[in-house]
Interface confidence: medium
């Protein structure tokens, strides 16, 4: 990019109710999702010759919440470099000065679908365990930098037709710290861990609960703890898993404990009943062992008491998952978060605006000097999004869907024509 931005580098196009003003290298913009932060378009990068996702953060500094989220996302995306976490390919703003600064555009890898579109596919054990393995690798990488995601859900996880998986959206990620009295309203309700629902604070394995919920949903084909509100969410958990022990109750704050202890007592259902053999993906006798292992993993992830719940490391070493274990993926060097105050920052709107602008300018400067971080080799998907014709065990399906990098529940594509329909 040249030192002084000129209008000839950009062009504007109307997308839904928004105007995208993007670098001319990005052509054929097509909306694929919208969420709290803005609109996401698929586009063709004429320089790299690949399809990409362009996410417009419209006036990201309009309020404290938007500003902090945008800043956090920018910093984390710039720092994190792991094959199971979405890669940032470019960042730009069409505005020329801080005074004019309005919009940020993030250019990211374009994937084929999010997990919402996979839920109604009965994946075989090989594919299911591989998807879970990749989720765990991505989560472990974040945890290694002290980042606890807390917002894992099918719409925040994207896949390609070759069964590769990436985690999206750091908007709600928060660096782990010793203060466990944190806000309970951070995770989409259905995937929210008990310790978050009950305001107990959390540690890394809060994300394991979410993985368990997602795995259960992949197996059953529907949300497993579908609460109508926060209180009902807790009811859904205990109805199925049973009322937790007195030992767990002692860890609760008095008011919460009083409420929880006064709920009806549920014995819970055996995991053999919740997840009977015959509903698991099954194509060979060998799969009976895999089914048993899958159920065992579910029973260790879906544990109400976080102190008794499996850790990410333990999950990666579980028999159902460990067949995929590769130290390069599961033990990748932790990302270096260069802003030590990332989570503690509180600023006036104008300060946020300046911080975000500096991040964008820093990216532009670094890319101009050729020092942007290395991208994983599988950074983007080819323009046709067609899987290889090989009989690779990881090939999910013949793709027949719009590509997506949508990351909010309300922005996920219609799951009725999911990408894996042709290959269960």
């Amino acid at each position: 990019m040249s030192d002084s931005k000129c209008d000839s580098q950009f062009y504007s196009v109307q997308v839904a109710d928004s105007t995208f003003t993007v670098l001319k290298r990005y052509q054929q913009l097509k909306p694929i999702g919208s969420g709290a932060q803005g609109i996401v378009c698929a586009a063709f990068d004429t320089v790299l010759g690949i399809n990409v996702a362009v996410k417009k953060l419209s006036r990201p500094f309009q309020n404290q919440t938007h500003a902090k989220r945008a800043y956090r996302e920018l910093v984390l995306l710039k720092c994190v470099n792991h094959k199971n976490i979405i890669s940032l390919l470019n960042v730009f703003t069409p505005q020329k000065t801080l005074e004019e600064f309005q919009d940020v555009y993030l250019v990211m890898e374009l994937m084929d679908a999010n997990l919402c579109q996979v839920i109604h596919m009965e994946l075989d054990h090989e594919r299911m365990s591989y998807l879970l393995y990749q989720m765990l690798c991505g989560i472990k990488h974040l945890h290694s930098a002290g980042i606890i995601h807390r917002d894992l859900k099918p719409s925040n996880i994207v896949v390609k037709s070759d069964c590769t998986l990436k985690i999206l959206d750091f908007g709600l990620a928060r660096t782990a710290c010793t203060n466990f009295m944190m806000t309970p309203y951070v995770v989409t309700r259905y995937y929210r861990a008990p310790e978050v629902i009950l305001g107990m604070g959390y540690k890394e394995n809060v994300d394991i609960w979410s993985v368990g919920c997602i795995m259960g949903e992949l197996v059953k084909g529907c949300v497993i703890f579908q609460g109508t509100d926060h209180i009902d969410q807790w009811n859904k958990v205990i109805e199925q898993l049973g009322t937790p022990s007195a030992e767990f109750m002692k860890k609760l704050q008095p008011t919460v404990r009083n409420y929880v202890e006064n709920r009806p007592k549920y014995p819970g259902i055996k995991f053999e009943e919740l997840f009977p053999d015959w509903i698991f993906p099954s194509e060979s006798e060998r799969d009976k062992i895999k089914t048993s292992q899958a159920r065992d993993l579910l029973s260790k992830m879906l544990v109400i008491d976080p102190d008794k719940r499996i850790s990410v490391d333990e999950a990666l070493r579980h028999p159902y998952i460990t067949v995929w274990y590769d130290p390069a993926e599961a033990e990748a060097p932790p990302p270096q978060i260069y802003d030590a105050q990332l989570e503690e920052r509180e600023h006036a709107i104008e300060e946020w605006k300046e911080l975000i602008y500096k991040e964008v300018m820093d990216w532009e400067e670094r890319s101009k000097n050729g020092v942007v971080k290395d991208q994983p080799s599988d950074a983007a998907v080819s323009s046709n999004a067609t899987p290889s014709q090989s009989s690779s065990i990881n090939d999910i399906s013949s793709m027949s869907t719009e590509q997506t990098l949508a990351s909010d529940t309300d922005s996920s594509l219609d799951a009725s024509t999911g990408p894996l329909e042709g290959c269960r």
Epitope: Y266, I269, E273, S282, E285
Partner: antibody, heavy 117, light 107 residues
Framework: EVQLLESGGGLVQPGGSLRLSCAAS????????MSWVRQAPGKGLEWVSA????????YYADSVKGRFTISRDNSKNTLYLQMNSLRAEDTAVYYC??????????WGQGTLVTVSS | DIQMTQSPSSLSASVGDRVTITCRAS??????LNWYQQKPGKAPKLLIY???SLQSGVPSRFSGSGSGTDFTLTISSLQPEDFATYYC?????????FGQGTKLEIK
Amino acid sequence: EVQLLESGGGLVQPGGSLRLSCAASGFTFSSYAMSWVRQAPGKGLEWVSAISGSGGSTYYADSVKGRFTISRDNSKNTLYLQMNSLRAEDTAVYYCARSHTVYFDYWGQGTLVTVSS
Amino acid sequence: DIQMTQSPSSLSASVGDRVTITCRASQSISSYLNWYQQKPGKAPKLLIYAASSLQSGVPSRFSGSGSGTDFTLTISSLQPEDFATYYCQQSYSTPYTFGQGTKLEIK
């Protein structure tokens, strides 16, 4: 298009046997669990039996346990229900249904089994 | 076994009416409830799964709600082809059980 076609129903005496078949097409048969659901004349629906995609795991309602056997031949895309020691209360229309984990998303048209002397 | 009880057992309504059928489980079944439609001499057809998710191809006038023990199937504006028998089914724990059915007739 998903299609399920039952056959093998008919009139049988109490204590007799019958084997029902369900020919499936339009989907990857071996990837889906399958079920038999029955409906006595003028009555409601009763889930009878289920089998996993490989045939390795089966489930039976208490009312038929020990008398009925569910099986499948994935090479022929066919589901079976072997019914022995039939009783008058087994009289029903028997439907085969594709079991998408926790619900039955496609059903055959059914075959009538009448147990009477 | 979990018992499923539907009410009413039958009801008469007119085209264009809004109709509600309820289903009660003998114990909490979370959101593991499905609704089926059956016409005389035909196989049942899945309408709603997981209490509120509309099966692909089913008209949007059908909706489901509820959680725990009490569930509702609503038809917002009855069409002539909607006159049939409706069944609820729990898939919370085996054996999966059905309600006795609700027959919807033309008034």
